[in-house]
């Protein structure tokens, strides 16, 4: 289905990508009413932003090209430091080269800013999306995906890394956010909740969805993730909400049916290649976009987030399999693996469609409070 409070239009049809009907507003808990238990434990225990090292003190690093990313963030956590002999590296996402960012968890210690200082940044992800406040940007064209339909061979690695289930993608999956904004898909992973508890990372007007898929991409302007971290537009993530529907999703079943094999933290298996685009909504034209960060350490900023308006439907059994099969660190179930939403701190979320227009009878005038900042306008 579509996200709440969207302009009505004709349904695009369900299929594996879900229906395109709007959620009723009565389904949306208000911010005050939403139970705090939906947020992962521990994040509230982090010191307030004013208690953390401010990134505005770090030297600014200009993006390599003015067209990388739609927002020009002034205080990205980017520090040039000597490292590899080939080229200077952007090292702000770690304290020193030897730091091991694998030792973190959802909730409890260590606080993420101690694992990676960038986690205390001002422009973090995930965020709460409020369609009424989104800026309609006609310049945001439909996403273009090429090479996402993979043959069965060679097989792909499906891994339980203790934080999520991750499918590593081969070279050749190309994605364009627009002209000159080209990326290659690196991996996809999921975030989920627990029985009766939703676990998406992004929320919409405070509403948390059952689960969320992230497809992580590297800009073709960069050779490696290490060089792209913290650079505006260096990484881009396509995100879609997963919801409960009446039918089994055959695309997701190809992965979910293999989860038992990787129940143990650190375990992995090989799965036949599949149509990666079938894991995403079918409507590539309607989405929200903003500049944020990785949602796990190293929390590097400059990440372009594209959150689909249309959701993906999985059966109740599939959502249960997702949230109830894997184990994480310390003999605990791998559940509720989402980060609490982060403040926008002045960022404007852009929409590729007039998301702020409410077609219900109560809205006499369309409300569009923010103007478009998209590159190319």
């Amino acid at each position: 289905q579509r996200l709440p409070r969207m302009q009505e239009d004709s349904p695009l049809g369900g299929g594996s990508s879900g229906e395109d009907d709007p959620l009723g507003e009565e389904d949306l808990p208000s911010e005050e009413d939403s139970p705090r238990e939906e947020d992962p434990p521990g994040e509230e225990d982090l010191p307030g932003e004013e208690d953390l090292p401010g990134e505005e003190d770090l030297p600014e690093v200009k993006p390599k090209s003015e067209e990388e990313g739609s927002l020009k963030l002034e205080d990205l956590p980017t520090v040039e430091a000597p490292g590899d002999p080939q080229e200077p590296q952007n090292n702000a996402h770690r304290d020193k080269e030897g730091d091991d960012q694998s030792h973190w968890r959802y909730g409890g210690d260590p606080p993420w800013p101690r694992v990676s200082p960038a986690c205390a940044g001002r422009f973090q992800s995930p965020v709460d999306i409020r369609p009424q406040l989104a800026a309609f940007c006609p310049a945001l064209r439909p996403l273009e995906l090429l090479g996402f339909q993979l043959p069965p061979l060679p097989e792909l690695r499906l891994r339980n890394n203790g934080h999520s289930v991750q499918l590593t993608l081969p070279p050749g999956l190309e994605m364009a956010l627009g002209p000159g904004r080209e990326y290659r898909a690196l991996q996809l992973h999921l975030h989920w909740g627990a029985a009766g508890r939703p676990g998406s990372e992004h929320t919409v007007e405070g509403h948390r969805f059952p689960a969320e898929i992230h497809v992580v991409h590297l800009s073709t302007a960069f050779a490696r993730v290490d060089e792209a971290l913290g650079r505006p537009g260096g990484l881009a993530v396509l995100a879609a909400f997963l919801e409960e529907g009446p039918e089994e999703n055959s695309a997701y079943e190809q992965l979910l049916s293999r989860l038992e094999e990787i129940a143990e933290e650190g375990s992995e298996t090989q799965v036949p290649g599949l149509d990666i685009s079938a894991l995403l909504p079918s409507d590539f034209s309607r989405y929200f976009q903003y500049e944020g960060s990785l949602t796990t350490p190293p929390c590097a900023q400059g990440v372009i987030w594209t959150v689909f308006n249309q959701t993906v439907m999985l059966s109740a059994k599939q959502l249960h399999t997702l949230s109830d099969t894997l184990w994480g660190p310390g003999d605990s179930r791998l559940q509720l693996n989402f980060r609490a939403t982060q403040p926008l701190n002045g960022r404007v979320i852009e929409a590729s469609f007039p998301a702020g227009v409410d077609s219900s009878p109560r809205a006499a005038e369309p409300v569009q409070l923010n103007s478009c900042l998209a590159a190319g306008d």
């Epitope: 080939q86 730091d99 934080h163 050749g172 992580v216």
Partner: antibody, heavy 124, light 111 residues
Framework: SQSVKESRGRLVTPGTPLTLTCTVS????????LIWVRQAPGKGLEWIGI?????SAYYARWAKGRFTISKTSTTVDLKITSPTTEDTATYFC????????????????????WGPGTLVTVSS | ELVMTQTPSSVSAAVGGTVTINCQAS??????LSWYQQKPGQPPKLLIF???KLASWVPKRFSGSRSGIEYTLTISGVQCDDAATYFC?????????????FGGGTEVVVK
């Protein structure tokens, strides 16, 4: 300075297991991918296998079952399970040129530094 | 299985001339290709990474390019010191077996 170095090579008889060790200095193995490569006398370079920062190892098809790659915090081992005379070669280890982000599907696009290599001779 | 086909196996060039070495991947490897120079008794030395980027110690007469699954190493204005064997290395995956492969090598002889 960052470097890798293979342990001294040996003369072994066929069938006698042999472990080569790549010792690293100046960087943390927990953040880098390493490869093992070999070169028979007068021949080209042959990729044996790779171990990523999370300790997962993968091999060339011809090498699977014949070699095992593992690591500790400062060393990467290459075990030749049952050497044959065809395994006579100089063995090299090399490191991915930048920090590896395996959890992000990162792939190596070049290897540096390389060890000086060590000669293994398998002969009866 | 990734296969890297390198041509030619040997090439001769006069000082100041140009040498072109090609590598073709059996499947898409994007820019995950590197070039190495090896002299007798020495380990390989990284010349070019990410298909076209020069390592900091490499003279500007070396260059790398990519067109689809075909990769080219060019030495313009060959010097005596460039006499060596050159190898390409392609990486398709480090999360499956058979995910990387070297080309067969090209011996460059400088006259």
């Amino acid at each position: 300075s960052q470097s890798v170095k293979e342990s001294r090579g040996r003369l072994v008889t066929p069938g006698t297991p042999l472990t080569l060790t790549c010792t690293v200095s100046g960087f943390s193995l927990s953040r880098y991918t390493l490869i093992w490569v070999r070169q028979a006398p007068g021949k080209g370079l042959e990729w044996i296998g790779i171990i990523d920062s999370s300790s997962s190892a993968y091999y060339a098809r011809w090498a699977k079952g014949r070699f095992t790659i593992s690591k500790t915090s400062t060393t990467v081992d290459l075990k030749i399970t049952s050497p044959t005379t065809e395994d006579t070669a100089t063995y090299f280890c090399a490191r991915d040129r930048v920090l590896s982000y395996d959890d992000y599907g990162d792939l190596p696009d070049g290897f540096d530094p390389w060890g000086p290599g060590t000669l293994v001779t398998v002969s009866s | 299985e990734l296969v890297m086909t390198q041509t030619p196996s040997s090439v001769s060039a006069a000082v100041g001339g140009t040498v072109t070495i090609n590598c073709q991947a059996s499947q898409s490897i994007s820019n995950y290709l590197s070039w190495y120079q090896q002299k007798p008794g020495q380990p390989p030395k990284l010349l070019i990474f990410a298909a076209s980027k020069l390592a900091s110690w490499v003279p500007k007469r070396f260059s790398g390019s990519r067109s689809g699954i075909e990769y080219t190493l060019t030495i313009s204005g060959v010097q005596c010191d460039d006499a060596a064997t050159y190898f390409c290395l392609g990486v398709y995956s480090i999360s499956t077996d058979d995910g990387a492969a070297f080309g067969g090598g090209t011996e460059v002889v400088v006259k």
